[in-house]
């Protein structure tokens, strides 16, 4: 067990051009507060998970009113540290999110209004018991300077707060299998502390906070007996000695979740989904207030000023759940139009548009017919991110500006010769054929196959095709 401590040194405009506008004004005074969220590990999954290591909310800072015309200075900060207690081992590697919130104090209907000013995040390695680490993070035009450390709470010591030290019972040596606690040579390592509530008779641990069951016992605290009477139930792992193990009651039988929590079985044991105002393995811990920072991922806590009143988390877009602990997959909505690629960056949604489209959601068809003229009597046909011109006879090209060669497609059949003409094309048919495209054979008796040659035109004469 131990405490992660965060000290905010300054929050104000970062270096470089484009200083941000002050978040407060004479008409709308405001004050800042901060929220920190900690997650174990450096993996990508950690970024999507709730604040598994804990979260904390600072006090409100002093009220600030912008001086008209003055650039935004470093803003007045709340007093004190943000402290995030952790019960189990310090993971050594962790992810953090620090949010800067603005509380507007104008004449708001229904109380003050909150808005997120900046959010910074990072992944770090940190040994418990070490010195303060300093950091600078930028969010847009804002800059946040802070320090942090992790310290163990007695009797825990070590870089992970897993070694426990007790004063020596005898002046000369520590107990069997226990070493002196360097650098506190006058103290000894204490035995491992298993998960709270782990059955002392049926459970044991090899790591702090663990609870592993002896054969014949199951459940998260090794308090549920295992029956070996029958092997019909699919529940339970197989055992070399008994052939199979069948828990008498299933993990959720009798609902181990208190205070109206709902139970769901997991591969190892069970999981409780707690109603608002309760948390813990079995929803046994009550009295959560907004001061406990129960809302994850930038959720804003409302109500719950005292343990008897429930709090409500107002989740930012992209998150849901009673504690804003679940991420919404915004890309599943396919917000990027016209074949655009969706990227959910967490803090924002981005679309990578196909050629011919633009806009935040690829909604702007750049190649549509608006404002485009097809020359020489052509008409514009749009759709699918491209426009094309349907050209009048004798013209071609993207905008119908090119004079088409009507003979290019070899329109005269049966060896007829094609001649370009101002009004189209003319086919000079080979002997034995007639028609606009020389498509009709001439019968030996001089009669043609349907249709007949127009009056006054002999078979074999050139025919104009209009």
């Amino acid at each position: 067990a131990g405490v992660f401590e965060l000290q905010i040194h300054s929050f104000g405009p970062g270096p470089g051009p484009g200083a941000p506008r002050s978040p407060c004004s004479a008409r709308l005074p405001c004050r800042l507060f901060f929220r920190v969220c900690l997650k174990p590990g450096l993996s990508e999954e950690a970024a999507e998970s709730p604040c598994a290591l804990g979260a904390a909310l600072s006090a409100r800072g002093p009220v600030y009113t912008e001086q008209p015309g003055a650039p935004a200075p470093d803003l007045p900060l709340p007093d004190g540290l943000l402290q995030v207690p952790f019960r189990d081992a310090w993971p050594g590697t962790f992810s953090f999110i620090i949010e800067t919130w603005r509380e507007e104090l104008g004449d708001q209907i229904g109380g003050p209004a909150w808005s997120l000013l900046a959010r910074v995040a990072g992944r770090r390695r940190l040994a418990a018991g070490g010195p303060w680490a300093r950091d600078i993070q930028r969010a847009g035009a804002w800059e946040l300077r802070f320090s942090y450390r992790a310290r163990c709470e007695p009797p825990a010591v070590g870089t992970a707060c897993t070694r426990l030290c007790r004063p020596r019972s005898a002046p000369s040596r520590c107990g069997p299998g226990l070493r002196p606690c360097a650098p506190l040579e006058d103290e000894c390592e204490a035995p491992l502390v298993c998960r709270a509530g782990c059955s002392p008779e049926h459970g044991f641990c090899e790591q702090p906070g663990e609870c592993r069951c002896l054969e014949g016992w199951t459940g998260p605290l090794c308090t549920v007996p295992v029956s070996t009477s029958s092997c019909l139930s699919p529940r339970g792992p197989s055992s070399a000695t008994t052939g199979c193990l069948v828990p008498g009651p299933g993990p959720c039988d009798g609902n181990p979740c208190a205070n109206g929590g709902s139970c769901s079985e997991t591969p190892r044991s069970f999981e409780c989904t707690c109603p608002r105002g309760f948390y813990g393995l079995r929803c046994e811990v009550s009295g959560v207030t907004c001061a406990d920072g129960p809302c994850f991922n930038g959720g804003l806590c409302v109500g719950g000023a005292d343990p008897d009143s429930a709090y409500i988390c107002h989740c930012p877009p992209g998150f849901q759940g009673s504690n804003c602990e679940k991420r919404v997959d915004r890309c599943s909505l396919q917000p990027c139009r016209n074949g655009g690629l969706c990227l959910d960056l967490g803090h924002a949604l981005r679309c990578r548009c196909r050629a011919g489209f633009a806009g935040p959601r690829c909604e702007h068809d750049l190649d549509d017919c608006a404002g485009r003229a097809c020359a020489n009597g052509g008409t514009c046909v749009e759709g699918g991110g491209a426009h094309r011109c349907s050209c009048a006879l004798g013209f071609g090209g993207r905008d119908c500006r090119e004079r088409a060669d009507p003979c290019a497609a070899r329109p005269c059949a049966h060896g007829g010769r094609c001649y370009a003409h101002f009004s189209g094309l003319v086919c000079a048919c080979a002997p034995g054929y007639m028609g606009a495209r020389c498509e009709f054979p001439v019968h030996p008796d001089g009669a043609s196959a349907l249709p007949a040659a127009p009056p006054g035109l002999r078979p074999g004469d050139p025919q104009r095709y209009l």
Epitope: I109, A113, S115, P317, R330, L333, Q334, P335, R337, N338, A348, L349, G359, P360, R361, E363, H364, D365, D368, G383, G384
Partner: antibody, heavy 121, light 107 residues
């Protein structure tokens, strides 16, 4: 409660100018894109213009492009539509409407009551 | 531009009736179709977005369906307050365009 209140409408001669305003309250104005939509007497709805939450993306209908200018002041929770070179066919009730968060759907989820613009000599 | 064609342009119905209004787009709008209600006073309200999602506070008797170019708004049991004009709007490609409207009148 989300509220949008339009103002600035009135009678103007063809070729004249008018500036409409839309005052927003009940939500974080700087998080949302806003649209102007109009409705000519006895006719249906016609989208006019759109401005994104930060003012970086602006779109206009072809019928008003080059004559109308949409703008916003996030510090004042206000939206504006500057209308120049007005024509008789611009006569309509003008509504401002809030877009959805992050413009995933390009909906107009809350509307004002409208302000009437009459262009006549 | 994408043209939105609404039908019918008007209809008469009684309280309790099931009413269906259709909207056809001139090309695929990939479900980015929204429905609005306008009361005679001029107030416009969003009813349904993204084809079938009910906007907050809208009664469940309103529902939407469709895909591609064809979309439908259904009122399962018409109530007195539902007599109004209904518009569809596509949110797929600029410019945003509305259907011509369907006026639902009392029979």
């Amino acid at each position: 409660e989300v509220q949008l209140v339009e103002s600035g409408g009135g009678l103007v001669q063809p070729g004249g100018s008018l500036r409409l305003s839309c005052a927003a309250s009940g939500f974080t104005f700087s998080d949302y894109g806003i649209h102007w939509v109009r409705q000519a007497p006895g006719k249906g709805l016609e989208w006019v213009a759109y401005i994104s939450s930060g003012g970086y993306t602006i779109y206009y209908a072809d019928t008003v492009k080059g004559r109308f200018t949409i703008s916003r002041d996030n510090a004042k929770n206000s939206l504006y539509l500057q209308m120049n070179s007005l024509r008789a066919e611009d006569t309509a009730v003008y509504y401002c409407a809030r877009g959805d968060y992050e413009d995933i759907f390009y909906t107009m989820d809350y509307w004002g009551q409208g302000t009437t613009v009459t262009v006549s000599s | 531009d994408i043209q939105m064609t609404q039908s019918p342009s008007s209809l008469s119905a009684s309280v309790g009736d099931r009413v269906t209004i259709t909207c056809r787009a001139s090309r695929d709008i990939t479900k980015f179709l929204n429905w609005y209600q306008q009361k005679p006073g001029g107030a416009v309200k969003l009813l349904i977005y993204y084809t079938s999602r009910l906007h907050s506070g809208v009664p469940s008797r309103f529902s939407g369906s469709g895909s591609g170019t064809d979309y439908t708004l259904t009122i399962s049991s018409l109530q007195p307050e539902d007599f109004a004009t209904y518009y569809c709007q596509q949110g797929n490609t600029l410019p945003w365009t509305f259907g011509g409207g369907t006026k639902v009148e009392i029979k």
